[in-house]
Amino acid sequence: IWELKKDVYVVELDWYPDAPGEMVVLTCDTPEEDGITWTLDQSSEVLGSGKTLTIQVKEFGDAGQYTCHKGGEVLSHSLLLLHKKEDGIWSTDILKDQKEPKNKTFLRCEAKNYSGRFTCWWLTTISTDLTFSVKSSRGSSDPQGVTCGAATLSAERVRGDNKEYEYSVECQEDSACPAAEESLPIEVMVDAVHKLKYENYTSSFFIRDIIKPDPPKNLQLKPLKNSRQVEVSWEYPDTWSTPHSYFSLTFCVQVQGKSKREKKDRVFTDKTSATVICRKNASISVRAQDRYYSSSWSEWASVPCS
Amino acid sequence: RAVPGGSSPAWTQCQQLSQKLCTLAWSAHPLVGHMDLREEGDEETTNDVPHIQCGDGCDPQGLRDNSQFCLQRIHQGLIFYEKLLGSDIFTGEPSLLPDSPVGQLHASLLGLSQLLQPEGHHWETQQIPSLSPSQPWQRLLLRFKILRSLQAFVAVAARVFAHGAATLSP
């Protein structure tokens, strides 16, 4: 058993049929010595008396808010949560496996630049009695500070018969060094509590591996005289690291109709302009990627050909 | 060339060669993400590689103030990786595929380090740790880790030379 926060404890249980469970001793936070009784949750049934209560925790029915009283007055609470371990593996029932970029990916994180700011998000089908708390650091043995905000519900989607909820959190490295080569990864830890179930999820990454620039901005077209060609120009996204002579992007320019199966014109460039062939009912799209490190491409920025 | 007395390197040549190094480093190990090397433990094996750190003057301001600190750090790293790529980690079993770009990568690391330091002038170089994994699978894992680390190193070096070519070239 360990303390998650004040008056909230997590009991780690091996979860299998007829498991013996864990013996837990609760102590009432009071100077009083006698006349103390214990109850669980809203029940008035007295579970025991005395300053300490010893219980065998085997299942979720044994978890909950234990309260010690004296003469009708509440003295203190202890909330017991369960963390299940099945076949040596901690349960991951609360969050959905996003399966990208690989199986068992529960947390996904992205950064728009090298400033040390990043966003992580996760998915669940649970809508109520759910809380998250996020901690982060650079490195684990001698951790350097990363400050994370509160996790918030950022999107709701319908997937077949189910509703899916997306939560996200923003974090900022306290002393970021955008130009340096990272040697220690960022660690992100998410504590998830649903009713009386506790789970924790972690992710470890270098900012360079989660970079995904915003799409290029201000796409403009200039038709070339006596030609089917069009000069398309754009600018670096505002959120990208500066100076651009140091933090350079490379771009992919594509002309394509509405369907992915349609024919296309495609060219890669390090410049912020390119000449392509525009077709009626087609769009010109441009996306960006770090020029020197193959992290994710941005989403496309598009303008119609006409 | 970054010669004694602190004159400027051939920024544009260094830019071209460092960008080539980036391409080669990714050709040598494109499967980033397919193998999470941090899950594989034994971090000490690649902890000894020289990293371009915050105080090394490789940021735009540091380069403007005095690029020599940064160039020396990059040179150290190039020599370090060049030696690693020539060591039995890469030459031993399992043999590299005949079309592996590691050979080109090795030659290009040497080429860029020579651009930075002409014969007769010696910057201090970092000692290469004795990394001699006994098992072929350990060697394979170590190659992956070294190449991952090299990708990050050459990305910073390429940014330095691109910025230098754009803003510090005479």
């Epitope: 024919k263 014109d265 460039t269 | -």
Partner: antibody
Framework: QVQLVQSGAEVKKPGASVKVSCKAS????????LHWVRQAPGQGLEWMGW????????ESAPKFQGRVTMTTDTSTSTAYMELRSLRSDDTAVYYC???????????WGQGTMVTVSS | EIVMTQSPATLSVSPGERATLSCRAP??????LHWYQQKPGQAPRLLIY???QSISGIPARFSGSGSGTEFTLTISSLQSEDFAVYYC?????????FGGGTKVEIK
């Protein structure tokens, strides 16, 4: 599968014109760009131009502008390349090729030998 | 127009050996570079597109690398059917242009 079949060899006199055909099969004709590339005997490859069968748009290399006409007949899935004012250095194998991407050449015809000789 | 330069013009290699073919551009063309193989009396065949992207049906012994101005086609272990002429082609700008070719012959 995608296939391009070209017309047979031609012998032309200097100053004449030649029209080479290229019949496409195995795909929707308007879904691919069509290019023409030529190769003089013992020489390298030279791009001449492209046509979009969907709308008839064309673009040719500056060297051939005013001398080459590329057309298509969507009813027969056939592309044509006409080269006028032939000279002896136009002697070459002329290839048509098709691709969904505009700037490189995926599927090639078997080639048509055009000999320009007086 | 962009003039592409291939080297060497002829490469003599023994079967089973590795062949490295080079293609240079006079200015940066990013990764807008494609490789073709042509055997005598046949039309060319696309091997690699956008510098390093492999084509289904093309043996894995063919690989491409490079970006900017320098590109390489590597044939890891030459088979008898690989002796042919290889061309690079830039698609950075129109007109599309080819290199002069590298003939890979039996040593």
């Amino acid at each position: 599968q995608v296939q391009l079949v070209q017309s047979g060899a031609e012998v032309k006199k200097p100053g004449a014109s030649v029209k080479v055909s290229c019949k496409a099969s195995g795909y929707t004709f308007t879904d691919y760009y069509l290019h023409w590339v030529r190769q003089a005997p013992g020489q390298g490859l030279e791009w001449m131009g492209w046509i979009d069968p969907e709308n008839g748009d064309t673009e040719s290399a500056p060297k051939f502008q005013g001398r080459v006409t590329m057309t298509t007949d969507t009813s027969t899935s056939t592309a044509y390349m006409e080269l006028r004012s032939l000279r002896s250095d136009d002697t070459a194998v002329y290839y048509c090729n098709a691709n969904k991407e505009l700037r490189y050449f995926d599927v090639w015809g078997q080639g048509t030998m055009v000999t320009v000789s007086s | 127009e962009i003039v592409m330069t291939q080297s060497p013009a002829t490469l003599s290699v023994s079967p089973g050996e590795r062949a490295t073919l080079s293609c240079r551009a006079p200015q940066s063309i990013s990764i807008n570079l494609h490789w073709y193989q042509q055997k005598p009396g046949q039309a060319p065949r696309l091997l690699i597109y956008f510098a390093s992207q492999s084509i289904s049906g093309i043996p894995a012994r063919f690989s491409g690398s490079g970006s900017g101005t320098e590109f390489t086609l590597t044939i890891s272990s030459l088979q008898s059917e690989d002796f042919a002429v290889y061309y690079c082609q830039q698609s950075n700008s129109f007109p599309l242009t080819f290199g002069g070719g590298t003939k890979v012959e039996i040593k």
